[in-house]
Interface confidence: low
Amino acid sequence: QPRSPKSKRKGQGRPGPLAPGPHQVPLDLVSRMKPYARMEEYERNIEEMVAQLRNSSELAQRKCEVNLQLWMSNKRSLSPWGYSINHDPSRIPVDLPEARCLCLGCVNPFTMQEDRSMVSVPVFSQVPVRRRLCPPPPRTGPCRQRAVMETIAVGCTCIF
Amino acid sequence: QPRSPKSKRKGQGRPGPLAPGPHQVPLDLVSRMKPYARMEEYERNIEEMVAQLRNSSELAQRKCEVNLQLWMSNKRSLSPWGYSINHDPSRIPVDLPEARCLCLGCVNPFTMQEDRSMVSVPVFSQVPVRRRLCPPPPRTGPCRQRAVMETIAVGCTCIF
């Protein structure tokens, strides 16, 4: 539909500041929360997010569609994404929220349908985790921890 | 099917694996490099990226346009981004590469022109840094370091 896309709601040239609606869990990893947080706080935040994910319908969401009713960038994107839980028992935190692109293509801004001539790709970032390094069996020494950076998808973008 | 934009180069239904061309600095923070890296390696990688940024034309790039010649996702995106250097002398690393959206709107996939009825927004992630915490003047005690998580833009996505 050759027409300026669907962000222009009546009397509104472009979306205003996105603010959470009622009953909406702030799962949006895109929003800039605080400029920085302590490590302990960061790990606590991750645990909270994982808990929120488990309690929300977010994990079940597999639909390639844009939702203009929601304030979160991840659901308003042309390359929308949801979150899955990246689980690894040999890591602290064991569970990490990871972005998962909901479309192979991108949402065509005119038809609001998936368009496979573009491609949704993850935007990766490196996050700090602690790896449990245990000696191979039969275990003789204790497990050690090493701080490492793990690559994780934090969002999706639409490319040609 | 809403088929669209200009990704369909001759004989190519969708972009293949993106691989760097000659003389191209792999500045793409979107690509998944290694699953994980040690902290020291991570800090070294950041220093290398900052050095590459300083030596490339990347910092001067301010144009809202898609470049299909380049392999990097950040230049092929409907919400293209470049990198700036986030400089903070009270932090280690002092310099962090930060994504900067090149468009206020997004690139319209039909016209390849900027379309202000959509909006480019940063995708944020939290990265580990060490903060130098020094007592206020007159300084009596030594400066300490605290590991904190700093929020930084790692890419951009296009929203309605």
Partner: antibody, heavy 119, light 112 residues
Framework: QVQLQQSGPELVKPGASVKISCKAS????????INWVRQRPGQGLEWIGW????????YYHEKFKGKATLTVDKSSSTAYMLLSSLTSEDSAVYFC????????????WGTGTTVTVSS | DVLMTQTPLSLPVSLGDQASISCRSS???????????LEWYLQKPGQSPKLLIY???NRFSGVPDRFSGSGSGTDFTLKISRVEAEDLGVYYC?????????FGGGTKLEIK
């Protein structure tokens, strides 16, 4: 002046295919969408789909998927519609019409091509 | 699909009379961007359709000012203040707000 010149009438057998053309002149072909519209004898107008010549991108009305295939030849500023597996139901006048991105209206229409499906 | 229903099917008028054609959509055709892509076209016998009105009430260039469009949401009207002989033909409304785009069934304006 701006014109969309369509190919002449076609008489085709059931089950066959036909490719009709729409040649644009007087404007930059790659800047406008080309739409196709069907009009059965004594009936109203039905939108089939569009193609954007700048990129070759297409969008079809669900009803016409598999029936119509839209293509363009930028070098000759010509849009084509291939109609396949024809039946008597496909007998109609087919129009092309252009629209500019950001507007929607069909400001220029083609002359129309009559397709008759008969054995 | 959005169903566009035009009334009347046939409209007999005398030259110089006012004519009014109604078009009703099965759902709101206000696009999410705030625009309403409702057009009116006139098709004379043996000819291609011609654009008269776009976005509900905007007259296309060269269209006489006796033609006017109005309405909102789901109800739209085309008015011809003083019908002339050259106005005779079939009038179609069209919505371009939701895919698939759809035309009304047409209203035939004829001489009484």
């Amino acid at each position: 002046q701006v014109q969309l010149q369509q190919s002449g009438p076609e008489l085709v057998k059931p089950g066959a295919s036909v490719k009709i053309s729409c040649k644009a002149s007087g404007y930059t072909f790659t800047d406008y969408f080309i739409n196709w519209v069907r009009q059965r004898p004594g009936q109203g107008l039905e939108w089939i789909g569009w193609i954007f010549p700048g990129s070759g991108s297409t969008y079809y009305h669900e009803k016409f998927k598999g029936k119509a295939t839209l293509t363009v030849d930028k070098s000759s500023s010509t849009a084509y519609m291939l109609l396949s597996s024809l039946t008597s139901e496909d007998s109609a006048v087919y129009f092309c019409a252009r629209t500019l991105y950001g507007n929607w209206y069909f400001d220029v229409w083609g002359t129309g091509t009559t397709v008759t499906v008969s054995s | 699909d959005v169903l566009m229903t035009q009334t009347p099917l046939s409209l007999p008028v005398s030259l110089g009379d006012q004519a009014s054609i109604s078009c009703r959509s099965s759902q709101s055709i206000v696009h999410s961007n705030g625009n309403t892509y409702l057009e009116w076209y006139l098709q004379k016998p043996g000819q291609s359709p011609k654009l008269l009105i776009y976005k509900v009430s905007n007259r296309f260039s060269g269209v006489p000012d006796r033609f006017s469009g109005s309405g909102s949401g789901t109800d739209f009207t085309l008015k011809i203040s003083r019908v002339e002989a050259e106005d005779l033909g079939v009038y179609y409304c069209f919505q371009g707000s939701h895919v698939p785009y759809t035309f009304g069934g047409g209203t035939k304006l004829e001489i009484k």
